[in-house]
């Protein structure tokens, strides 16, 4: 963890080292402030490298719902709609944190938990691999 | 908040709805036991729509150094490494959890907060915008 | 448990169209995809197309320009409607669910649960 | 179109005997950034609906006895039932899913000697 001065206004903690077991307040605050607020909401379809959302739910998880992408073809969409399949579709995966319930129902104590999921596909050249 | 039922054994809380303070163990657990575990790690270089990752540190929030893609190019690269302006190079965004220090520089006092973040890039058809 | 089960007209008459539907259960239609497969009397099997779990579809290009595959999700149903039919049309038609598999990144064009089949015979 | 080729088109066996059914396809099935074939198997016996046995060609499906065996890469692939039941008989056929359309190849019927 990063050694941070500690504020004389902070909650009380027993150990003044990197906590293992924080407080945490669920008021989300968002930040998307984006100058480029435009959605990724229809790449899914334009993509050249397609995909489609699946819906993933865990009540033990916060949050509850995650969006899993697909790629639709193991090749990529040409123009004139066909599928290239010397070009191949592959996943965009990101690790993302989530809480997750511990002990499991409770409803006020969570463990930090790493996750990946794809968020969308991309179009890439193959890997050749070379016959000795 | 999705209704749970609550179990004995869990820690203390005031309040028995969805709480909006909870306790969090930050020892990551990762679940990436993933059945297709091919790193995205080359993709940028190899898509249509390459990418370049910046860093972005923030020691006031965890995870501090989150990873933004930024494309390449207006347009897609083409087999022979030209960019085709026919097609857009467009940033793939999630949506992700983060945790903020509040009050800031407290080592054990957290608030949920939502930022967006570029992934990665797809290659996609342009919209085309027809003038009357 | 998973089943899938078509139902139709038994017999259409040449130029006309053919309407199946399929009615699923033990799965939902937003969460899986289904495609339609036939085979024709004597031969294999053919895949003609699929409605991904999102309502998208996606053709065999030999049927494209008189296929369309659409759904009633409240209903459970997937409908397949094919124009212009002729004898080479007849065939058992089958619905099948694709496979879903967590933590794999593709949409999966394996069938792991069929219907019993439809017989479409095309005759005047 | 990706051809799928089936031999033998059919097999007579006797009750207890290891097989082996061939499918041959007209381009490779493996996908390099995965190194998966996409290659399937299934079963399908005379009024009922077809069966998924194998996917990915070596993965058995759930359920599917461990006398069912995929094998192969590329082109080549095999299913082998090892001591063939009576419940076996039945036509096989292989499918491709990695280029559209999905092909089958036009089956091979086991039958009793």
């Known amino acids: 963890g990063i050694a941070i001065p500690r504020n004389s206004g902070c909650p009380n903690s027993e150990d003044k080292n990197f906590p293992r077991t924080v407080m945490v307040n669920l008021n989300i605050h968002n930040r998307n402030t984006s100058t480029n607020p435009k959605r990724s909401s229809d790449y899914y379809n334009r993509s050249t490298s397609p995909w489609n959302l699946h819906r993933n739910e865990d009540p033990e998880r916060y949050p509850s719902v995650i969006w899993e992408a697909k790629c639709r073809h193991l090749g990529c969409v040409k123009a004139d709609g066909n599928v290239d399949y010397h070009m191949n579709s592959v996943p965009i995966q990101q690790e993302i944190l989530v809480l997750r319930r511990e002990p499991r129902h409770c409803p006020n104590s969570f463990r930090l938990e790493k996750i990946l999921v794809s968020v969308g596909c991309t179009c890439v050249t193959p890997i050749v691999h070379h016959v000795a | 908040g999705i209704a749970i039922p609550r179990n004995s054994g869990c820690p203390n809380s005031e309040d028995k709805n969805f709480p909006r303070t909870v306790m969090v163990n930050l020892n990551i657990h990762n679940r990436n036991t993933s059945t297709n575990p091919k790193r995205s790690s080359d993709y940028y270089n190899r898509s249509t729509s390459p990418w370049n990752l910046h860093r972005n540190e923030d020691p006031e929030r965890y995870p501090s150094v989150i990873w933004e893609a930024k494309c390449r190019h207006l347009g897609c690269v083409k087999a022979d490494g030209n960019v085709d302006y026919h097609m857009n190079s467009v940033p793939i965004q999630q949506e992700i959890l983060v945790l903020r220090r509040e009050p800031r520089h407290c080592p054990n006092s957290f608030r949920l907060e939502k930022i967006l973040v570029s992934v990665g890039c797809t290659c996609v058809t342009p919209i085309v915008h027809h003038v009357a | 448990q998973v089943e899938l089960r078509e139902s139709g007209p038994g017999l259409v008459q040449p130029s006309q169209t053919l309407s199946l539907t399929c009615t699923v259960s033990g799965f939902s239609l937003p969460s899986h995809s289904v495609s339609w497969i036939r085979q024709p009397p004597g031969k294999g099997l053919e895949w003609m197309g699929i409605?991904?779990?999102?309502?998208?579809?996606d053709y065999n290009s030999a049927f494209k320009s008189r296929l369309t595959i659409s759904r009633d999700t409240s209903k459970s149903q997937v409908f397949l409607k094919m124009n212009s039919l002729q004898t080479e049309d007849t065939a058992m038609y089958f619905c099948?669910?694709?496979?879903?598999?967590?933590?794999?990144?593709?949409?999966?064009?394996?069938?792991?649960?069929w219907g019993q089949g439809a017989s479409v015979t095309v005759s005047s | 179109d990706i051809v799928m080729t089936q031999s033998p088109s059919s097999l007579a066996v006797s009750i207890g005997e290891t097989v082996t059914l061939n499918c041959k396809s007209s381009?490779?099935?493996?996908?390099?950034?995965?190194?998966?074939?996409?290659l399937a198997w299934y079963q399908h016996k005379s009024g009922q609906s077809p069966k998924l046995l194998v996917y990915w060609t070596s993965t058995r499906q759930s359920g599917v006895p461990d006398r069912f065996m995929g094998s192969g890469s590329g082109t080549d692939f095999t299913l082998t039932i090892s001591s063939v039941q009576a419940e076996d008989l039945a036509i096989y056929y292989c499918q491709q899913s990695y280029y559209t359309p999905y092909t089958f190849g036009a089956g091979t019927k086991l039958e009793l000697k």
């Open positions: 409605i991904w779990n999102n309502g998208g579809t």
């Open positions: 381009q490779s099935l493996l996908f390099s950034e995965n190194q998966k074939n996409y």
């Open positions: 099948a669910r694709n496979m879903y598999i967590t933590d794999y990144y593709y949409e999966n064009y394996f069938m792991d649960a």
